[in-house]
């Protein structure tokens, strides 16, 4: 019987933190950070902050975009500051060109 | 095609009212926030008011709140405000515009003016 | 609320120069920053979204950049029809939604 590997401390990255699971912080502390927007009543949404386990964001960062979804992920300290995840949009972009950042 | 057309506006002394509507065609118009903006002579952009598509969630800016009241109806694809207790410093063209945040597309506006 | 300032009010330029405009948030916004060119008499039109995003069918001599509180957007050869009033707004924070004064780019 072959034996466990031992499991190596994972790597833990500092994102940026927006959005309304992210109370009073601007940051946050994971294995992975997010960019994500989706739709609200008519409204964008846009969140950022992290995945504390790897697994927690392995499907989500894998989805592909949809008319009402999009997250983008990346691994990095602050990785998630200049990605601003957008709707896939066919031809002309209206009407996916709404935004509300929930605070 | 895409478009919103505004209507309503017009001439209205101090303390009278007035109601905006604007026509949707070309989009699933519930799908959809909207906003009110308008635009005084002269003058740059103020964000006045903003629904949900659902038209469950309103927002005002606080020179409007409690005077203006933004509704839908959305089997009419129409967008309303209701202004009342009308000042001349409401004088402005009011524009209807696809969502809360980013503007996009506009209508062409409707001159509201307030005077004595 | 945050309020937004754009530099310079007004200028002055010839067709072909490149001409930058700035915008400053008096908070972070992140990359939630528009832009929109208005024409006397019509209503303005989205040319950037997200601070860099270039709206459909607007020239790709249009180009916005910034993150924070510092936005910019040049436009790389001035056309005679880009003289008009620029404005740039932040759609980071719930309402109230706020606009910058606005910037009137005339013919030197």
């Known amino acids: 019987m072959e034996d466990e590997k031992p499991k190596v401390n994972p790597k833990l990255y500092m994102c940026v933190c927006e959005g309304l699971s992210c109370g009073n912080e601007d940051h946050c502390e994971g294995q992975q950070c997010f960019s994500s927007l989706s739709i609200n009543d008519g409204f964008h949404v846009y969140q950022k902050g992290c995945f504390q386990v790897y697994e927690q964001g392995k499907m989500t960062c894998k989805t592909p975009p949809s008319p009402g979804q999009a997250v983008e992920c990346c691994q990095g300290d602050w990785c998630n500051r200049n990605i601003t995840a957008q709707l896939p949009t066919k031809g002309k972009s209206f009407p996916g060109t709404q935004n509300f950042h929930l605070e | 095609e895409v478009q919103l057309v505004e209507s309503g506006g017009g001439l209205v002394q101090p303390g009278g009212s007035l109601r905006l509507s604007c026509a949707a065609s070309g989009f699933t118009f519930s799908t959809y926030a909207m906003s009110w903006v308008r635009q005084a002579p002269g003058k740059g952009l103020e964000w006045v008011s903003a629904i949900s598509g659902s038209g469950g969630s309103t927002y005002y800016a606080d020179s409007v709140k409690g005077r203006f009241t933004i509704s839908r109806d959305n089997s009419k694809n129409t967008l309303y405000l209701q202004m009342k207790s009308l000042r001349v410093e409401d004088t402005a063209v009011y524009y209807c515009a696809n969502s809360p945040s980013w503007f996009d597309p506009w209508g062409q506006g409707t001159l509201v003016t307030v005077s004595s | 609320d945050i309020q937004m300032t754009q530099s310079p009010s007004s200028l002055s330029a010839s067709v072909g120069d490149r001409v930058t405009i700035t915008c400053r948030a008096s908070?972070?916004?992140?990359?939630?920053l528009n832009w929109y060119q208005q024409k006397p008499g019509k209503a303005p039109k989205l040319l950037i979204y997200?601070?860099?995003s270039l709206q459909s069918g607007v020239p790709s001599r249009f180009s916005g950049s910034g993150s924070g509180t510092d936005f910019t957007l040049t436009i790389s050869s001035l056309q005679p029809e880009d003289f008009a009033t620029y404005y740039c707004q932040q759609s980071y924070s719930t309402p109230p939604i706020t606009f910058g004064q606005g910037t009137r780019l005339e013919i030197k």
């Open positions: 997200a601070a860099s």
């Open positions: 908070q972070s916004i992140s990359s939630y």
